[in-house]
């Protein structure tokens, strides 16, 4: 997973005497916005699938009014980057379309008018994690300058963002069961270990050590059900103590969707479902035909030869909306069993299973001890997908093949000397100390200072100190 980022540096007239007239005037002030459409560069269906890798619409630029008699300068641009998140691997070779749109802010009936000022396209090779690449392209009398890059979202790394890696903890080798992240031999493959205690049913993680809750659950370990019955309004940030949703202002208040679009809340913001003939973040783009490529994510555009006739987008599997702009969250159905992490790859669902489980939906519970032998009389113990050997005295290691040195861990406290014995170890305590590990001081009058009850034992439980 990662993000493609596009930075527009300038949009203005190309050099030379034939500079275009400004797209804005005193009578018709306007502002610009940009649309980027990405697709895998070498896919055969690329032409028919305009935005299979994703698309993004910029914010509106500042309002610009032409100064009479002055040549068109570079036009004021929207702030920030255009970001296109990608869930799957970065393809390395990609195709792009960048469109410059003009929003006229005159006294049009029915809201602002839209027109496409310029469109540039190209195919490039780009490794994720690399530096910014800059491009300059002409479109008619206009010149567009932009930079782009692709970066991975941690813990994904590599030129395609397909490997989960972390820096090596030990200088010489990776931890048990972990392979080096070739070709980055100084990194190790990271096991996807959620925060300890994270609910396997209601929590999941996309990075080691985190615990993210499925809808309806809250708390640091996703063990607290969200109860809305005692709340004033089913909205707002969750209260950690009650698990109750505290009321707050809703992103759909006042309906930000124009042109009859309907608003629905999302975890971060809101989403507009636009009527046919409109698209954009707030359904503000209109007068669109199939020639404008309004269908995102590989949607097939039908009809709409002129601005007055509607078009229809036939969406590919995994996408919906009048412009195929919404990814169907098929993971919300929780298809992965036994705490597996659901990944919607667009073309397919994938379950990343927790250790000890397998199958397309993590439905198979693996027998960790099957075919595993513990040497030297050790017995196999199943545990969370990783078999473990409980070794007989005097042996250790993963399969009990190593002869254990019980004194290696220096178990005798307060200067006691350790002796290996057939039954384990024996501590010879220094003067003034006693106990199996020489852990208790002996009082000068000869009475021992044994605790009333060691931690974890109730008074009256059998206590063996020696």
């Amino acid at each position: 997973a990662g993000v493609f980022e596009l930075q527009i540096h300038s949009f203005g007239p190309g050099p030379g005497p034939g500079a275009p007239r400004s797209p804005c005037s005193a009578r018709l002030p306007c502002r610009l916005f940009f649309r980027v459409c990405l697709k895998p560069g070498l896919s055969e269906e690329a032409a028919e699938s305009p935005c299979a890798l994703g698309a993004a619409l910029s914010a509106r630029g500042p309002v610009y009014t032409e100064q009479p008699g002055a040549p068109a300068p570079d036009l004021p641009l929207p702030d920030g980057l255009l970001q296109v998140p990608f869930r799957d691997a970065w393809p390395g070779t990609f195709s792009f379309i960048i469109e410059t749109w003009r929003e006229e802010l005159g006294d049009q009936i029915g809201g602002p008018a839209w027109s496409l000022l310029a469109r540039v396209a190209g195919r490039r090779r780009l490794a994720a994690g690399g530096p910014w690449a800059r491009d300059i392209q002409r479109a008619g009398a206009w010149e567009l300058r932009f930079s782009y890059r692709a970066r991975c979202e941690p813990p994904a790394v590599g030129t395609a963002c397909t490997r989960l890696c972390r820096p090596r903890s030990a200088p010489s080798r990776c931890g048990p069961g972990l392979r080096p992240c070739a070709p980055l031999e100084d990194e190790c493959e990271a096991p996807l270990v959620c925060r300890a205690g994270c609910s396997p049913e209601h929590g999941f993680c996309e990075q080691p050590g985190e615990c993210r809750c499925l809808e309806g659950w809250t708390g640091p370990l996703c063990t607290v059900p969200v109860s809305t019955s005692s709340c004033l309004s089913p909205r707002g940030p969750s209260s950690a103590t009650t698990g109750c949703l505290v009321p707050g202002p809703g992103p759909c208040d006042g309906n930000p969707c124009a042109n009859g679009g309907s608003c629905s809340e999302t975890p971060r913001s809101f989403e507009c479902t636009c009527p046919r003939g409109f698209y954009g973040l707030r359904c503000e783009v209109s007068g669109v035909t199939c020639a404008d490529g309004p269908c995102f994510n590989g949607g097939l555009c039908v009809g709409g030869a002129d601005p007055d006739s509607a078009y229809i987008c036939h969406c590919p599997p995994g996408f919906q909306g009048s412009n195929c702009e919404k990814r169907v969250d098929r993971c919300s159905l929780q298809p992965c069993r036994n705490g597996g992490l659901c990944l919607d790859l667009g073309h397919a669902l994938r379950c990343r299973c927790r250790a000890g489980f397998a199958g397309p939906r993590c439905e198979h519970d693996l027998d960790d001890c099957a075919g595993r032998a513990c040497a030297n009389g050790g017995t196999c113990v199943e545990g969370g997908g990783a078999h473990r050997c409980s070794c007989a005295l005097g042996f250790g290691g993963r399969d009990c093949r190593e002869r254990a040195d019980p004194c290696a861990a220096r178990p005798c406290a307060h200067g006691g000397r350790c002796y290996a014995h057939f039954s384990g170890l024996v501590c010879a305590c220094a003067p003034g100390y006693m106990g199996a590990r020489c852990e208790f001081p002996v009082h000068p009058d000869g009475a021992s200072a044994l605790p009333a009850a060691p931690p974890g034992l109730r008074p009256g439980d059998p206590q063996r100190y020696l």
Epitope: A47, A121, G122, R123, R124, R134, D135, I136, R138, S147
Partner: antibody, heavy 117, light 107 residues
Framework: EVQLQQSGPELEKPGASVKISCKAS????????MNWVKQSNGKSLEWIGN????????SYKQKFEGKATLTVDKSSSTAYMQLKSLTSEDSAVYYC??????????WGQGTTLTVSS | DIQMTQSPASLAASVGETVTITCRAS??????LAWYQQKQGKSPQLLIY???SLEDGVPSRFSGSGSGTQYSMKINSMQPEDTATYFC?????????FGAGTKLELK
């Protein structure tokens, strides 16, 4: 007036290296990429690669990777192309050309390289 | 790499005649095509970009058209100063690639 002034003709022996320069004037040097193009004995044109003087990033046609190295000196608004391990196949006219990816609007006058023992 | 096939390799035309040069790409290049003119002993000069946009200062008798993989450049009324070699160049994908050229002579 935009101008790209290239260095003079070069005669080199096989195995040697050569560095051709292209001095830009009349525009903001970091505002456009600098492309390099090879033309062998008056025949077709072949794109070698380009360099972005702003970020310093460069891109090459695969066959010229290891053969050509593109650099810039922003302080003097000059682009350079170094060709190494020269053979007779490298004998050609080399052009620098200002532009973006879909236009080369100004070209240098060309530098003739002759590789001969 | 995208291959550009240019035709004809050479042709001769009389003053006032209409000349058409064509260029075929090995795959769809989405209008990303430029045309250059190179006169004998000179550097190439940009005529047309984005398949049909005329560069500043280029006479209006030059025009470009086409889409997909097929593109052409037309000189509406041949003039003596149009004697040159013409190259097409695809700008859709890196590496940028040129056609082999068309040598246009005065008849």
């Amino acid at each position: 007036e935009v101008q790209l002034q290239q260095s003079g003709p070069e005669l080199e022996k096989p195995g040697a290296s050569v560095k051709i320069s292209c001095k830009a004037s009349g525009y903001s040097f970091t505002g456009y990429n600098m492309n390099w193009v090879k033309q062998s004995n008056g025949k077709s044109l072949e794109w070698i690669g380009n360099i972005d003087p702003y970020y310093g990033g460069s891109s090459y046609k695969q066959k010229f990777e290891g053969k050509a190295t593109l650099t810039v000196d922003k302080s003097s608004s000059t682009a350079y192309m170094q060709l190494k391990s020269l053979t007779s196949e490298d004998s050609a006219v080399y052009y620098c050309a200002r532009g973006g990816s879909n236009f080369f609007d100004y070209w240098g006058q060309g530098t003739t390289l002759t590789v001969s023992s | 790499d995208i291959q550009m096939t240019q035709s004809p390799a050479s042709l001769a035309a009389s003053v006032g005649e209409t000349v058409t040069i064509t260029c075929r790409a090995s795959e769809n290049i989405y209008y990303s095509l430029a045309w250059y003119q190179q006169k004998q002993g000179k550097s190439p000069q940009l005529l047309i970009y984005n398949a049909n946009s005329l560069e500043d200062g280029v006479p209006s008798r030059f025009s470009g058209s086409g889409s997909g993989t097929q593109y052409s450049m037309k000189i509406n009324s041949m003039q003596p100063e149009d004697t040159a070699t013409y190259f097409c160049k695809q700008t859709y994908d890196v590496p940028l690639t040129f056609g082999a050229g068309t040598k246009l002579e005065l008849k």
